[in-house]
């Protein structure tokens, strides 16, 4: 049979499989559809596994290409290095294998740039543009553990027939990860069905041992048992259920506990209940109730938007500044007039479309209509423990080959990241709070006090404009979204790119797999906290068309209204804020409920690395983050250097308070 | 060397079918897609689709769906255009040219050999 | 689709000249987009691939740039062999394979 044949297939081992996915995409598309099934491109940095990659690729056609996890920004080259400044992604650059095809060349390497597997040969490692659509993609998964396949009985009609839990089936395999099927066919007519799960006594094994094929007591009908017949030892049946399942009151039939289980969107059978609750990615259980998910910010990404971005429930919009437009890959933002805006429709109709209605998408748009502020200043991140975003199957690394290396290097633009997704048995769950670190230099003092948009009392939805909101006191705090904490490190601007580190969206499009539940979602939560105020500052509130007199020359206003509010410091309970310099209490803008619109987006600014270099030294050194694949954009002309009004003062607004372009998402990624 | 001659019949008559064969040697003819290209005289040129002979895999430009049908035969290295119903607008030099794989590390798309052309005129 | 367009559609220069030609696409291609030369009665030839990388044998004087969805394709000192008529294309396979509409180059 021709191993190109269109079912994709994989080859596991104890703790990670790869599969091969014989479909023509883009890299953007292959890591997208390797992530949607809770795995990654494939990152083979051993020997070892580069070795399990080239049994499971075989010997293919010398025209065909696979897409691994391999991706370089536009000049970011770094020929002495093994991976050439190439990022795996999954946020770093450690590797102990390399099969690059052709010795590193000095070339400029102005462009973005990502790397496919030659299916022939010696598996050869080739760059090219990101934007080709190759014959196929390589995809990781990481898991706890896995069973060994199953011994062939001989009562066996035939081999046994496993399903992974990302979806592929086959026989051929050697191991099988936690969350497997395997289902066994007997001679005798009847045959049982195993899960491969976590034992009491440690690690995971088959839900039942053998052998599954012997005796006729349970003939011919398997003893009436829906599940499993057991023979007792004075020859009567009883029947028992699989995994995940729970013996019905007739003792023969087996009942599903997610069936009625009031999870808002997954359910996963077990635990003292009988059955447990997760999030989909890009939500978290409610802290008040964990059947109840609530929405991540997926504007805290970095990257994920090339100028600005706004949060909303289960997903985010990218937009760029006045004077700029959104490029078609729906991140980068480039001068007005660069491309068509026809093309960049096309592509929102072509490459974004997730079979939703576009009325919802203006719907969606319309609560968000008028001015805003970009959060305050340029953010420098520190890495700090990453949200427990838990994918069951991801690759797992061991942790000896962790990069030993402060990252970022003085030498070594940071790419743009996310925190690494930590492997976990549940399927989909958060279980805490994100919390977001940043400093930010200590700047000369204010010419322009921080910004804030206002809130109008009975606007229409027309008119309504964006919140920052303070934490709403009468809320369960599972509608209080995770912490943007600001601090100051005494650094020149001048060297210091901006730089966000954040999550990632939810990535369910419309085509789900069964694992993944369709669930939409409607409506906007979000809450912005801005950093310390100082009190000699009072913030002003945007309102759309309103003068301002001229500022400093090199600072870049909004359009503003003076409106004193009260500020209010509120203390932000059970939060660990993970900075080098001291935090400043967060002050917030306590808004009456009444006058909050509908939707509160937050925007952040967000600027892609060029090739400049950062001082900061982690808190976590070893923590890594996934490389967000994205196609390159011009750089943004955006990130003036404002000065700060205090060491305490919340860094001033950015960009000019009209809207050039956005582009809608939910659950679409670039 | 690379090498690629297209061949045909030269004159079609309106509403018949156009069958153009190129043949390939000098490389392995399974591990390079073949691509059709259309240059009606003194324009520019048009892309009618391709075929991967490996495996029979063909993509067609939308505008000559249902009217072009590409083949191969392996044995011979030989590739086939089929364009059903011409018109005087299928008047063209058709070329058949090889996609490129890789070259100095690099893997690439673009058309990196091209045969001769053939050209084909509809007429009564 | 993916539009090509390019511009000039045609143009005249000394010998020893640089020339110039542009190429903006629809949407972006990244660098998936090459430039030919046709000359009269000729099959088209590969002279630059991935926007940047000059073909097997092309001379040095032909050379490209950019990324995304502008793109440039220059000949630094034109020479009498030059005469042709240069395309540039791009092959991203989504959906399809563009030309641009082709600039005739000439010596004044």
């Known amino acids: 049979q021709d191993p190109w044949a269109a079912e994709p297939r994989a080859a596991c081992g104890p703790s990670s499989c790869y599969a091969l996915f014989p479909r023509r995409r883009t890299f953007l598309e292959a890591w997208r559809a390797c992530r949607e099934l809770g795995g990654d491109l494939a990152t083979p940095r051993t020997p070892e596994e580069a070795q399990r990659v080239d049994s499971l690729v075989g010997a293919g056609p010398a025209s065909r290409l696979l897409w691994i996890g391999l991706q370089r920004q536009a000049r970011q080259c770094q020929l002495q290095r093994p991976l050439r400044g190439f990022t795996w992604t999954t946020g770093d650059q450690d590797t102990a294998f390399t099969n690059w095809a052709q010795p590193a060349s000095g070339g400029p390497c102005p462009a973005q740039r990502c790397v496919a597997l030659e299916a022939s040969g010696e598996h050869r490692w080739l760059e090219g543009s990101c934007t080709l659509a190759v014959d196929g993609y390589l995809c990781q998964f990481g898991f706890e553990g896995a069973c060994p396949a199953l011994q062939d009985e001989a009562g066996q009609a035939g081999p046994a027939v496993y399903t992974t839990p990302f979806h592929l089936v086959s026989t051929e395999f050697e191991w099988l990860p936690f969350g497997s099927v395997a289902a066994v066919q007997c001679q005798a007519g009847r045959g049982a069905s195993l899960l491969c799960v976590k034992q009491p006594e440690g690690g995971v094994g088959w839900s039942r041992a053998g052998p599954l094929c012997l005796g006729t007591g349970c003939s011919p009908d398997n003893g009436g048992c829906e599940h499993e017949c057991v023979e007792e030892v004075d020859g009567h049946v009883s029947c028992r259920c699989t995994e995940g399942f729970r013996l019905a009151a007739d003792g023969r039939s087996c009942e599903d506990p997610c069936a009625q289980a009031p999870c808002e969107q997954q359910c996963e059978p077990g635990g003292p209940q009988g059955y447990s609750c997760h999030c989909r990615l890009g939500f978290r259980p409610a802290e008040d109730d964990p059947h109840r998910c609530v929405d991540t910010d997926e504007c805290q990404i970095a990257g994920v938007c090339q100028q600005m971005c706004v949060n909303y429930v289960g997903g985010f919009e990218c937009y760029c500044s006045e004077g700029h437009e959104l490029e078609a890959d729906g991140i980068s933002c480039s001068p007005a007039g660069a491309m068509g805006a026809q093309a960049s429709q096309d592509l929102g109709d072509e490459l974004l479309d997730d079979g939703e209605d576009e009325e919802d998408e203006d719907e969606a748009w319309k609560a968000f209509n008028g001015g805003w502020t970009e959060m305050p200043g340029i953010l420098w991140m520190e890495p700090t423990q990453p949200p427990d975003f838990a994918l069951a199957y991801r690759p797992s690394f061991p942790e000896d080959r962790e990069p030993q290396i402060p990252y970022p290097e003085p030498t070594w633009p940071p790419p743009l990241s996310a925190p690494r997704v930590p492997y976990h048995s549940s399927v989909l769950s958060v279980t805490r709070p994100v919390v977001v670190s940043a400093t930010h230099p200590t700047l000369p003092s204010a010419h322009q006090p921080p910004v804030i948009p206002a809130t109008h009392p009975a606007l229409s939805r027309d008119h309504q404009i964006p919140v920052i909101a303070a934490n709403y006191p009468d809320l369960p705090s599972a509608y209080q979204p995770g912490i943007l904490s600001v601090s100051h490190s005494a650094q020149p601007p001048a060297h210091q790119p901006p730089m966000i580190s954040t999550k990632y969206p939810e990535l369910f499009p419309a085509h789900q797999s069964p694992m993944f539940p369709d669930t939409r979602v409607a409506g906007t939560q979000t809450t912005t906290h801005l950093p310390g105020i100082p009190p000699n500052h009072a913030p002003l509130v945007t309102t759309l068309g309103a003068q301002l007199p001229p500022q400093a020359p090199d600072a870049l206003v909004l359009r503003t209204q003076a409106t004193q509010l009260p500020i209010i410091p509120t203390a932000q309970p059970s939060l660990t804020t993970t900075s080098r310099s001291p935090v400043s209490p967060a002050h917030q803008i306590s808004v009456p409920a009444a006058t909050q619109p509908a939707a509160l987006p937050t925007l952040l600014p967000s600027q892609s690395p060029t090739n400049q270099t950062s001082p900061i030294s982690p808190t976590h050194p070893h923590s890594k983050a996934p490389q967000i694949p994205r196609e390159d954009g011009p750089s943004p002309k955006l990130a003036l250097w404002l000065p700060s009004p205090a060491p305490t003062a919340a860094p001033t607004a950015l960009g000019e308070a009209g809207l050039a372009e956005h582009s809608q998402r939910d659950d679409r990624w670039l | 060397q690379v090498q690629l001659q297209e061949s045909g019949p030269g004159l079609v008559r309106p509403s018949q079918t156009l069958s153009l064969t190129c043949t390939a040697s000098?490389?392995?003819?399974?591990?390079?897609?073949i691509h059709w290209v259309k240059q009606p005289p003194g324009r520019g040129l048009e892309w009618i689709g391709y075929?991967?002979?490996?495996?029979?895999?063909?993509t067609y430009n939308q505008k000559f769906k249902g009217q072009a049908t590409l083949t191969v035969v392996k044995s011979s290295n030989t590739a086939y255009l089929r364009l059903s119903s011409v018109t005087a607008e299928d008047t063209a030099v058709y070329y058949c040219?090889?996609?490129?794989?890789?070259?100095?590390?690099?893997?690439?798309?673009?058309?990196?050999?091209w045969g001769q052309g053939s050209l084909v005129t509809v007429s009564s | 689709d993916i539009q090509m367009t390019q511009s000039p559609s045609s143009l005249s220069a000394s010998v020893g000249d640089r020339v110039t030609i542009t190429c903006r696409a629809s949407q972006n291609v990244g660098t998936a987009v090459a430039w030919l030369q046709q000359t009269p009665g000729k099959a088209p030839k590969l002279l630059i691939y991935?926007?940047?990388n000059r073909y097997t044998g092309v001379p040095s004087r032909f050379s490209g740039s950019g990324s995304g969805t502008d793109y440039t394709f220059t000949i630094s000192s034109l020479q009498p062999e030059d005469i042709a008529t240069y395309y540039c294309?791009?092959?991203?396979?989504?959906?399809?394979?563009?030309f641009g509409q082709g600039t005739k180059v000439q010596i004044k």
């Open positions: 000098g490389y392995t003819f399974t591990d390079y897609v």
């Open positions: 075929i991967n002979p490996y495996d029979d895999d063909t």
């Open positions: 040219a090889r996609r490129g794989n890789s070259y100095d590390g690099y893997f690439d798309y673009s058309m990196d050999y």
């Open positions: 294309q791009q092959y991203t396979n989504y959906p399809m394979y563009t």
């Open positions: 991935s926007a940047s």
